[in-house]
Interface confidence: low
């Protein structure tokens, strides 16, 4: 049910493209296509190509993206395009100028001197932004979100965008300086992952990150469960990045117990993050499922 045909405006097209990209990524990383039928992979790739081609219609001369060509470009949407396209680079042919042009725009046009990324044209489809919605820690949450996207595009765009390493450092400095003041578990998780990717989630920051977990297995705020699934997925990615897996099994178990298979209104971020996190887990962790089965830890075949 995650393999869907993308369509609509620059936001709706990304909503439609997300589940297919993440489903293919997950099945590739965990080598589970046999269960679903190897022949379905090609069809899924065609849908991703279609989504990619359609998304280019919403690319502006500045290389940023918006719901419509004549609408002001969105920081969040452009960062999300970068994130999805960075993952899709291994699946279909993606023009690095499209990807790195968007990265350049984010850095040159939307990053303030203190490292913060600002949003001047919020997306119309607010349901697609997940836990960033109505977030009173917006500077931290959005900066973490954009920073994660930049880090995922780093290998592809480092040569084309000279300012990328400096931009990442600056955003990391801002997150680190303000991390201890965070109140929301969601922001602790997303910013925690952004910092963990840089090797900067340690000492008191790491302690705050770990102690924010409820019952040592989830990062939870009152309200929508979808946001908690998304937040806990970011946290799992951070834990995997930290490479100390003692904290991991209860978190994975909690995510599995949610029986959240993605899809549905407002699920874009939760779907993307839960499958990205669980794919990474199966690839990285010396986990209870593979360990005593002693199944070979195969790397993706591509």
């Amino acid at each position: 049910h995650l393999i869907v045909t993308p369509s609509g405006c620059g936001e709706q097209n990304m909503i439609g493209m997300t589940p297919t990209v993440i489903a293919v990524h997950y099945l590739d990383e965990t080598e589970q296509w046999e269960k679903f039928g190897l022949e379905k992979r090609q069809g899924a790739l065609e849908l991703i190509k279609k989504g990619y081609t359609q998304q280019l219609a919403f690319r502006q001369p500045s290389s940023a993206f918006a719901a419509f060509v004549k609408r002001a470009p969105s920081t969040w949407l452009t960062a999300y395009v970068v994130k999805v396209f960075s993952l899709a680079v291994n699946l279909i042919a993606i023009d690095s100028q499209v990807l790195c042009g968007a990265v350049k725009w984010l850095i040159l046009e939307k990053q303030k001197p203190d490292g913060v990324f600002q949003e001047d044209a919020p997306v119309i489809h607010q349901e697609m932004i997940g836990g960033l919605r109505n977030n009173n820690e917006k500077d931290m949450a959005l900066t973490a979100f954009v920073l994660i996207s930049l880090q995922e595009a780093k290998d592809i765009c480092e040569e084309q965008v000279n300012s990328l390493p400096g931009s990442i450092t600056k955003a990391g400095d801002f997150l680190e300086a303000n991390y201890m003041n965070l109140q929301r578990s969601y922001t602790v998780a997303i910013a925690g992952y952004a910092l963990a990717q840089m090797g900067r989630l340690k000492g008191p920051l790491l302690n705050k990150f770990l102690t924010t977990a409820k019952d040592k297995n989830r990062w939870e705020d009152p309200g929508k469960q979808l946001y908690n699934v998304e937040a806990t997925s970011y946290a799992l990615l951070a834990l995997l990045q930290l490479k100390d897996f003692d904290f991991v099994p209860p978190v994975v178990r909690w995510l599995n117990e949610q029986r959240y298979y993605g899809g549905g209104y407002g699920s874009t971020q939760a779907t993307f993050m839960v499958f990205q996190a669980l794919a990474q887990y199966q690839k990285d962790a010396p986990d209870h499922q593979e360990l005593n089965l002693d199944v070979s830890l195969q790397l993706p075949s591509r």
Epitope: L240, K243, N256, D284, P286, Q289, N292, L293
Partner: antibody, heavy 111, light 112 residues
Framework: EVQLQQSGPVLVKPGASVKMSCKAS????????INWVKQSHGKSLEWIGV????????SYNQKFKGKATLTVDKSSSTAYMELNSLTSEDSAVYFC????WGQGTSVTVSS | DVLMTQTPLTLSVTIGQPASISCKSS???????????LNWLLQRPGQSPKRLIY???KLDSGVPDRFTGSGSGTDFTLKISRVEAEDLGVYYC?????????FGGGTKLEIK
């Protein structure tokens, strides 16, 4: 033939450290996790921890945290375990397994 | 930690006769993925352990089919249909569902 070849027996003084090795051959090293297990004289087995040779990720039995440090060297297909601040309680045979088992390294702590 | 209790402590069997070892866990070993991570090892005198059975009942390659594993939840059994001289040693059960992994105390199989 699949083999895990462990380093030879050691005799060390209390307070010292020891680093033992476990060299894998006959299979792709990064394809299997390496567990480390302790067997005190005439006793049962105790799980120390596990390492993922692909990326160096570890998980430890809380009891051995701070006592044991697990590492790998992918280039030589070798896993290592270092034990520090040794006492007579650490005298035992230590096995690596993947699920094949090494022959064990005997550690004796004595002044 | 999950406690693994093996009985009997020692088992004295005549060659050609059957043998049975019990292993009980203090918590269910059924994982959330529907699998049960219970393994059996044999440690022959003066040797390192060798895995015989994983996932309750799956035999490792090269393990004779006179060995069978069964059970679910918290109760597990290893059976040898006809004991041979090479089967003597200490048998251990161990669980891989919960961290930390834990082993049973062992059952020593002696030949009468």
């Amino acid at each position: 033939e699949v083999q895990l070849q462990q380093s030879g027996p050691v005799l060390v003084k209390p307070g010292a450290s020891v680093k033992m090795s476990c060299k894998a051959s006959g299979y792709t090293f990064t394809n299997y996790y390496i567990n480390w297990v302790k067997q005190s004289h005439g006793k049962s087995l105790e799980w120390i921890g596990v390492i993922n040779p692909y990326n160096g990720g570890t998980s430890y039995n809380q009891k051995f945290k701070g006592k044991a440090t697990l590492t790998v060297d992918k280039s030589s297909s070798t896993a290592y375990m270092e034990l520090n601040s040794l006492t007579s309680e650490d005298s035992a045979v230590y096995f690596c397994s993947s699920p094949y088992w090494g022959q064990g390294t005997s550690v004796t702590v004595s002044s | 930690d999950v406690l693994m209790t093996q009985t009997p402590l020692t088992l004295s069997v005549t060659i050609g006769q059957p043998a049975s070892i019990s292993c009980k866990s203090s918590q269910s070993l059924l994982d959330s993925d529907g699998k049960t991570y219970l393994n059996w090892l044999l440690q022959r005198p003066g040797q390192s352990p060798k895995r015989l059975i994983y996932l309750v009942s799956k035999l490792d390659s090269g393990v004779p089919d006179r060995f069978t594993g069964s059970g679910s939840g918290t109760d597990f059994t290893l059976k040898i249909s006809r004991v041979e001289a090479e089967d003597l040693g200490v048998y251990y059960c161990w669980q891989g569902t919960h961290f930390p992994r834990t082993f049973g105390g062992g059952t020593k199989l002696e030949i009468k």
